[in-house]
Structure formats: C-alpha cells, structure tokens
C-alpha cells in the first residue's frame, strides 16, 4: 500500500512518497495536503555554489488521522512530510508556479525529518470502549542530508550543524519523531 503520488492544493501530482517505505498501519490516507516551502531556512550543503542560502528543502503539510487498532483519533493531526529532493530554492516548485525538479549530478541529497514534536491525541474506539489518550510523534521540520553507503546500509549524513528551522515563539516540544512515511506509533502494544 505505498503511496505512489498524491495531490497538493496546487493540483499537481508530486510523486514523492513512492520512494518511502510503506507508512505505519495507523496512517490513514491524507485528507488534505498543501505545500510549504522551507521558510527561508537554508540547509547546509555545498552543491555548485558557495551560497548555501540558495538551497532549500521542501516541506509539505500533511493531515491525517491516527489509528491504533480499531481506534481512530477524534481529530486529524497535521505534520510535515519532507520532500525527497533538495535543491536550489529558485528551482523548487511553489504552490502557484511549476518549477523544475533540480537534480544534483554528484551525491544524492535528500530532504529528511530533522526535528520532531509530540502531540497528544484522543483515540475513539468502537463498542463503547473508553477513549485512549496517546502521544504521537510528528515531524516539526526538515533538513537536507547526503546519502552515502555504510556497511551496505543506507546512511544519511548531515550537511552541517545547523539543521532545524527554529520554531517561532517556543522551542519544539521535546520529543517526537518520524520518518518520511510519517508517523504515528503503531499498533496498540498493550
């Protein structure tokens, strides 16, 4: 059940989730999706220019329900999906115009989750079962990493120390995580 493509609010198909692993079972199909550029945060990576501010890591807003067995969250949660491609900001498509995908000729660069946040969700269960409150991990920001090989395992290397876009007002709440496929913690373990 991998998602090969989905629509955003600019009505273009973005074939970006096909490379991701199958998402956790409790992820339902996205109900809404819209694109958000990287808020001007430049990831650290030298492509063909020394001006890192020219590069951007695309972030997509993703709204989904969290499920846990037969239970489902009362409300959908919104998080980010990190687009698989990093490139010059001027070439990344925005919500109105259609930019061209830029692909580096050298190493493989990926836009991946960087910081996570935790959010409490109320899970409603069938059959009169009491609601469950659960904390889930949600992607809070993305960054660019370079893909290298390590012991036959894919290993992603940071471009630099900078990384997350600071969140306005307050530091992202301690813990939460997730991956490209995005997140929720799966099966009810109890």
């Amino acid at each position: 059940q991998g998602w090969q493509a989905f629509k955003n609010d600019a009505t273009e198909i973005i074939p970006e989730l096909g490379e991701y692993p199958e998402p956790p079972p409790e992820l339902e199909n996205n109900k809404t999706m819209n694109r958000a550029e990287n808020g001007g945060r430049p990831p650290h990576h030298p492509f063909e220019t020394k001006d890192v501010s020219e590069y951007s890591c695309r972030e997509l807003h993703f709204t989904r329900y969290v499920t846990d067995g037969p239970c489902r969250s009362a409300k959908p949660v919104t998080e980010l999906v990190c687009s698989g491609q990093c490139g010059p900001a001027r070439l990344l498509p925005n919500a109105i115009g259609r930019g061209k995908w830029w692909r580096p000729s050298g190493p493989d660069f990926r836009c991946i989750p960087d910081r996570y946040r935790a959010q409490r969700v109320q899970l409603l269960c069938p059959g009169g079962e009491a609601p469950r409150a659960r904390k889930v991990r949600l992607v809070a920001s993305c960054k660019c990493k370079r893909l290298t090989r390590f012991h036959n395992q894919s290993e992603l290397k940071d471009f630099g120390t900078e990384a997350a876009r600071p969140q306005k007002g307050r530091k992202p709440r301690p813990r939460a995580r997730s991956a490209k496929a995005n997140q929720a913690e799966l099966e009810n373990a109890y």
């Epitope: 692993p21 079972p25 989750p113 996570y116 301690p174 813990r175 991956a179 490209k180």
Partner: antibody, heavy 117, light 111 residues
Framework: QVQLVESGGGLVQPGGSLRLSCAAS????????LSWVRQAPGKGLEWVSN????????YYADSVKGRFTISRDNSKNTLYLQMNSLRAEDTAVYYC??????????WGQGTLVTVSS | DIALTQPASVSGSPGQSITISCTGT?????????VSWYQQHPGKAPKLMIY???NRPSGVSNRFSGSKSGNTASLTISGLQAEDEADYYC???????????FGGGTKLTVL
C-alpha cells in the same frame, strides 16, 4: 509475542570496533522507532541512540556521537549499532528497545560489551 | 536539556506504600513532559511499569500508580511485596529526536 534479541557483544580493546545486532520478531518492525540503551556495571540506564521508521533520521547521545552509528534493515527486521573507537567507559550491557508512543514498551535481554586491554 | 533527579534509595515494609519521586530540571521546559517508569531486577532487562505519567500497561499490577505535579513525577507502590524490590527509573523525552532521558534510578528495598 514481541521479541528483541541482541547479539554481537564481547571483549574488545580500546580503540577497537564492534557491531551489535538486534533481531526483532512478533511485531511490524518497520512501524516503530527503535533505540539502543546501555547500562554500565552498577550504574543507571543511559540512552545511546535512536532511529526512525525508515532509518533516515538518527540521533545520538553526546558521549557516542561521531563514534557510533545506528542503522536498521527493515527487510531483515534487524537493528544495528556500529561502535568504533571504543573506550573503557563504553563498557556496558547494551539493550535494544522498541519505542511506542514515546516510551519503551519492549526491551531485549541485553548484550555485554567489555572494552579492556 | 532536561535532567531527572531521583532519590538513590527508598525502603518499606511488606504491605506498606512507598513513593519514589522524579524531579525534572530544564532550561526551557517549565514542567517535565510525560513520564514513564521502568522496573529493573538485578541482571534483567528493564520493564515498563507506567507510561504517560499514570497509565499502566496490561499485565502490570494496579498496585503501581503514577502522578505528576509541576516538575515532579511520582511512582507509588501500594501493598509492598518482596518481589517489588528492584531498581526503578523514571524517564521522559527531549531533544530534536525526542530521545529518552533517564533519571539516575532508585533502589527499592523491601524490609
């Protein structure tokens, strides 16, 4: 039932390397974050590293950053910890743990790593 | 960074109730996040006893309960039994990857 079984521990000299494995079964491996936690003899628990669902995001304790690498193979339901430049203070029992809803609901039995000359 | 502080040891007699505290300190968080408690018997792996401050996984006795007030979380064990003698660790999460932070551990002795 959920099972996590660590292996790969042993005696290694300072500066040496070791690779730990954690074989998982009884649950949907690719759907969980996983962590390594260690416990030095007579000491408390210390989180070492964690990894997200597909291995794209990894995090490390400052004490091991740059020396340890966590990875996972979802096709083999296995978690790894590559430990390089080992030091005496890395001597500990290393546990792998399954992370669900921001806590560790299942742990392996642990594997002992001894760094000594 | 968040740091969690626990008493090194507590003790009680069978049938009594005891409480283990876990106090959080942080430069940026006024009160600690959701806390979990783990029990560890000598030579064994830790076992989850309480999660999200006051929830018990199935199979854990209802003699174990958790609570939180401000930046201090507490684990209470009522009707103390000999098999409760173990080390207890509180934990929460912190950092960009929401990584686990453990308290120093508390040794519970059943007299």
């Amino acid at each position: 039932q959920v099972q996590l079984v660590e292996s790969g521990g042993g005696l290694v000299q300072p500066g040496g390397s070791l690779r730990l494995s954690c074989a998982a079964s009884g649950f949907t491996f690719r759907s969980h974050w996983l962590s390594w936690v260690r416990q030095a003899p007579g000491k408390g628990l210390e989180w070492v590293s964690n990894i997200n669902y597909d291995g794209s995001s990894t995090y490390y304790a400052d004490s091991v950053k740059g020396r340890f690498t966590i990875s996972r193979d979802n096709s083999k339901n296995t978690l790894y910890l590559q430990m390089n430049s080992l030091r005496a203070e890395d001597t500990a029992v290393y546990y792998c743990a399954r992370d669900t809803y921001l806590h560790f609901d299942y742990w392996g039995q642990g594997t002992l790593v001894t760094v000594s000359s | 960074d968040i740091a969690l502080t626990q008493p090194a040891s507590v003790s009680g007699s069978p049938g009594q109730s005891i409480t283990i505290s876990c106090t959080g300190t942080s430069s940026d968080v006024g009160d600690i996040n959701d806390v979990s408690w783990y029990q560890q018997h000598p030579g064994k792996a830790p076992k989850l006893m309480i999660y999200d401050v006051n929830n018990r996984p199935s199979g854990v006795s209802n003699r174990f309960s958790g609570s939180k007030s401000g930046n201090t979380a507490s684990l209470t064990i009522s009707g103390l039994q000999a098999e409760d003698e173990a080390d207890y660790y509180c934990s929460t999460y912190d950092g960009p990857g929401l990584s686990e932070v453990f308290g120093g551990g508390t040794k519970l002795t059943v007299l």
